[in-house]
């Protein structure tokens, strides 16, 4: 079988949901010594970057300015060391937002409920769309989908304090083109007296995995690596 290098990691620098006309930044983390990185979009070559010096950098950033629906879709990346190419990264879905109109999000029976109550979110958008999306802030990877002509329901079932937080919804014109976000609706879930004070609120981490962890190897790192290698040999 043809030999390949390990697949790189592809990430969106701040978020995979990019407002139209704003810039998206995708990171491809491969290997020190990679001489070329390629970004592919829907199976076609989109952009190329050649790091300088290649032995000091373990990845690159691809900038996609002026985001629009033509640039929204599935991205992947590969890299090359010498003549050897890596496997393809996993696919990353890049979404353009702030298209067309703004939906309205409401919650029934209301934004303040008791643990165990059944809650339903309603997302309404009068312009033609059939798919609606509900996202909890800080958990933008966990997208709930629902369908309807102008309104969609998102039944949450009996809620717990883990459901606390801010929610927004979008209308979707296709998988990668979303409306403006709705105004947020903050859901407050109270438990019984004993555990209310102890129940932690859901931390709203700003999708901490959507950060680029590219590193530039310094001379000091090289020296430390060499010293470590020498020490290991001496110990043997």
């Amino acid at each position: 079988p043809k030999q390949t290098l390990p697949k790189p990691i592809i990430r969106a620098e701040s978020t995979y949901m990019v407002p139209k006309e704003k810039q998206a930044t995708l990171c491809c983390q491969g290997s020190y010594g990679a001489v070329e990185y390629q970004l592919h979009f829907e199976g076609s070559l989109f952009a190329v970057e050649r790091p300088k010096p290649p032995e000091r950098i373990n990845g690159v950033k691809f900038h996609i300015p002026d985001m629009n629906s033509r640039k929204a879709g599935r991205y992947s990346c590969i890299y090359r060391v010498g003549e050897l190419w890596s496997e393809r990264s996993d696919l990353l879905d890049l979404v353009v937002t702030e298209m067309y109109d703004t939906p309205t999000l409401s919650v029934h029976p209301g934004p303040e409920v008791t643990s165990g109550e059944k809650v339903t979110f309603y997302c309404r958008l009068d312009t033609a769309t059939s798919m609606f999306l509900l996202l909890k802030e800080g958990r933008s990877r966990d997208v709930q989908r629902s369908y309807g002509k102008v309104q969609a329901e998102f039944p949450m079932g009996p809620v717990t304090t883990a459901h606390r937080g801010s929610y927004r919804c979008f209308g979707s014109y296709n998988n990668y083109a979303w409306s403006f976000p709705s105004e947020p609706v903050k859901l407050l879930v109270t438990g019984d007296i004993e555990n209310t004070s102890l129940a932690p609120t859901d931390p709203t981490f700003p999708d901490s995995w959507d950060t680029c962890l590219l590193t530039r190897e310094t001379g000091l790192q090289k020296d430390l690596a060499l010293w470590d290698h020498t020490a290991q040999n001496l110990l043997r």
């Epitope: 979009f41 076609s44 070559l45 989109f46 952009a47 190329v48 970057e49 050649r50 300088k52 690159v60 950033k61 691809f62 900038h63 996609i64 300015p65 002026d66 033509r70 640039k71």
Partner: nanobody, 126 residues
Framework: EVQLVESGGGEVQPGGSLRLSCAAS????????MGWFRQAPGKGREFVAA???????YYAESVKGRFTISRDNAKNTLYLQMSSLRAEDTAVYYC????????????????????WGQGTLVTVKP
């Protein structure tokens, strides 16, 4: 707003050479990634060559070794030197820009480009 105007097209015999130019208006040229695309009669637009802000280049396989892309930031001009021309190089050639861009990305996909020229016709025939 960036405006791109191509020139240098014309009729040439097979094996001949031409140099296309693309004059860009505005002060953003040095920070733009640039590219050349072409569209043959009855066909779709295809990538020819591209250049990053730092002069890294990338070519379509069909033109590699025959075409050279370059830029002169002082003159706000992009060039495409074409040699060993063939009948299949006959097309309207378009200059395109990605503005703004950061880093040294070379853009190959037409969707990446947000500014386009009107095109200049290159005809290769005996």
């Amino acid at each position: 707003e960036v405006q791109l105007v191509e020139s240098g097209g014309g009729e040439v015999q097979p094996g001949g050479s031409l140099r296309l130019s693309c004059a860009a208006s505005g002060r953003t040229f040095a920070s733009a990634a640039m590219g050349w695309f072409r569209q043959a009669p009855g066909k779709g637009r295809e990538f020819v060559a591209a250049i990053s802000r730092s002069d890294d280049t990338y070519y379509a396989e069909s033109v590699k070794g025959r075409f050279t892309i370059s830029r002169d930031n002082a003159k706000n001009t992009l060039y495409l030197q074409m040699s060993s021309l063939r009948a299949e190089d006959t097309a309207v050639y378009y200059c395109a820009a990605v503005v703004p861009t950061y880093g040294n990305n070379i853009y190959v996909h037409s969707a990446a480009y947000n500014y386009w020229g009107q095109g200049t016709l290159v005809t290769v025939k005996p």
